[in-house]
Amino acid sequence: EEELQVIQPEKSVSVAAGDSATLNCTVSSLIPVGPIQWFRGAGPGRELIYNLKEGHFPRVTAVSDPTKRNNMDFSIRISNITPADAGTYYCVKFRKGSPDVELKSGAGTELSVRAKPSAPVVSGPAVRATAEHTVSFTCESHGFSPRDITLKWFKNGNELSDVQTNVDPAGKSVSYSIRSTARVLLTRRDVHSQVICEVAHVTLQGDPLRGTANLSEAIRVPPFLEVTQQSMRADNQVNVTCQVTKFYPQRLQLTWLENGNVSRTEMASALPENKDGTYNWTSWLLVNVSAHRDDVKLTCQVEHDGQPAVNKSFSVKVSAHPKEQGSNTAAENTGTNERN
């Protein structure tokens, strides 16, 4: 009597995550009578994958009808494969009994699963930093297999070199994750800049996956301040302007102080953008010189994006302007502001 053979023709099978895998198994003889079972792994810790007689195996189906008389094909199909399904699968013949006795195992078929990396997610610093400071961006992608992957960082199309990348876990696993940190030196021109994290993997059809972050979320460009006096008007009023230039973001509060006393407070809003993404703002104050005996110290105080206030002062020389007789009206503080 010829010895029963359990034939698993493929040593290895590779499938893409989400696809179905067919694991082939045939037996050389109908005798002895007894069931076939499929296991993943060998030894005492092996996992039952399919048993025709009992159990609920929603993703596993028999390729042929195993209840048919003279059936010798016990191949199975596993649907919706995930990286967690990777492993070596054994087709095992049992002799019918109470309990059934394991008779012979196939040589095993190694199932390898290729899985695409998830879309890279780029996150920037929690708080804004000013130009000439270095900030870190992090890029993460998960769930890919095999482990080999390349990750590159770009700022405005130029590859970044100050990068640290880790693929986890270090050892063998069903799937892997990558995490990379890039350090980026900010400049005042970076409001419109973008960093891109680019991930390439064998499963991607030639096009790397990209994650992006805008440096506008990470940068603060502090304003330049300039206070100037316009020429004296015929009505004895001096126009003093405070030019606040090249700042980002727009969140800005400007306060005029006359001799240390608050004269007017304004909030920037709906400013047009400069080409580089920054903003400018000009505010002015009309000072009635005839209302003052002494020189007037005007201060333009700017609080930008919650940072400590920046001041720029200017003295209006009252002695340089002729006083109106009997005039004792308060300084004008109803100036208008112009938004550039």
Partner: antibody
């Protein structure tokens, strides 16, 4: 699933020539496609690929001698200024469904002869 | 660029023989290696991908092994239709470029 190359002919050195690879049974927007060549009696040589989105990538030796592009059903290889050394059979091929590391479907090839 | 060195460049064998062809990469390509069979005037045909996975429809007498830099294609029992030229092809996941070995011609002894 089928690939068929066309455009191979006898050409003059320096006169540009365009080869086409017409595909059927699948979408060019889903797979990387490649161009390869084989000089008479020699081995296979990789020229370049075009990604599913249409980005071309070339072998380091190409240096602008070839341009790969595609439409919805054809992939083209333009030989910009061919020399006699470009005489070969040119093959187009499609990468496998599991990844870009191998090519499972090939066209029969088209012969280009560059001669004065 | 990665170089692929295939050996031997040619061999003579008889039907039923076990044939082994090797391919060595100049640097590690992990398991990104494919084997093709080509007959005169025809396009290459994929036999093995990922170093050891048999492509569908390819007879089980063909097998591949190896990883890193050293790879082997084995034909366990040579058949008349197996007389052809065999090429290895690498893919490098960092440069994302392909390189072929120079080919091995299997002839009838």
């Amino acid at each position: 699933v089928q690939l068929v190359e066309s455009g191979g002919r006898l050409g003059q050195p320096g006169t540009s020539l365009t080869l086409s690879c017409t595909v059927s049974g699948f979408s060019l927007s889903s797979y990387v496609m490649g161009w390869f060549r084989q000089a008479p009696g020699k081995g296979l040589e990789y020229i370049g690929i075009i990604s599913s989105s249409g980005s071309p990538y070339y072998a380091s030796w190409v240096n602008g001698r070839f341009t790969i592009s595609k439409t919805s059903t054809t992939m083209d290889l333009k030989m910009n200024s061919p020399t006699t050394e470009d005489t070969a059979t040119y093959f187009c091929a499609r990468v496998g469904p599991l990844g870009v590391d191998y090519f499972n479907i090939w066209g029969p090839g088209t012969l280009v002869t560059v001669s004065s | 660029d990665i170089q692929m060195t295939q050996s031997p460049s040619s061999l003579s064998a008889s039907v039923g023989d076990r044939v082994t062809i090797t391919c060595r990469a100049s640097q590690s390509i992990n398991s990104y290696l494919a084997w093709y069979q080509q007959k005169p005037g025809k396009a290459p045909k994929l036999l093995i991908y990922s170093a050891s996975f048999l492509y569908s429809g390819v007879p089980s007498r063909f097998s591949g092994s190896g990883s890193g830099t050293d790879f082997t294609l084995t034909i366990s029992s040579l058949q008349p239709e197996d007389f052809a030229t065999y090429y290895c092809q690498s893919w490098h996941y960092i440069s994302r470029s392909y390189t072929f070995g120079q080919g091995t011609k299997v002839e009838i002894k």
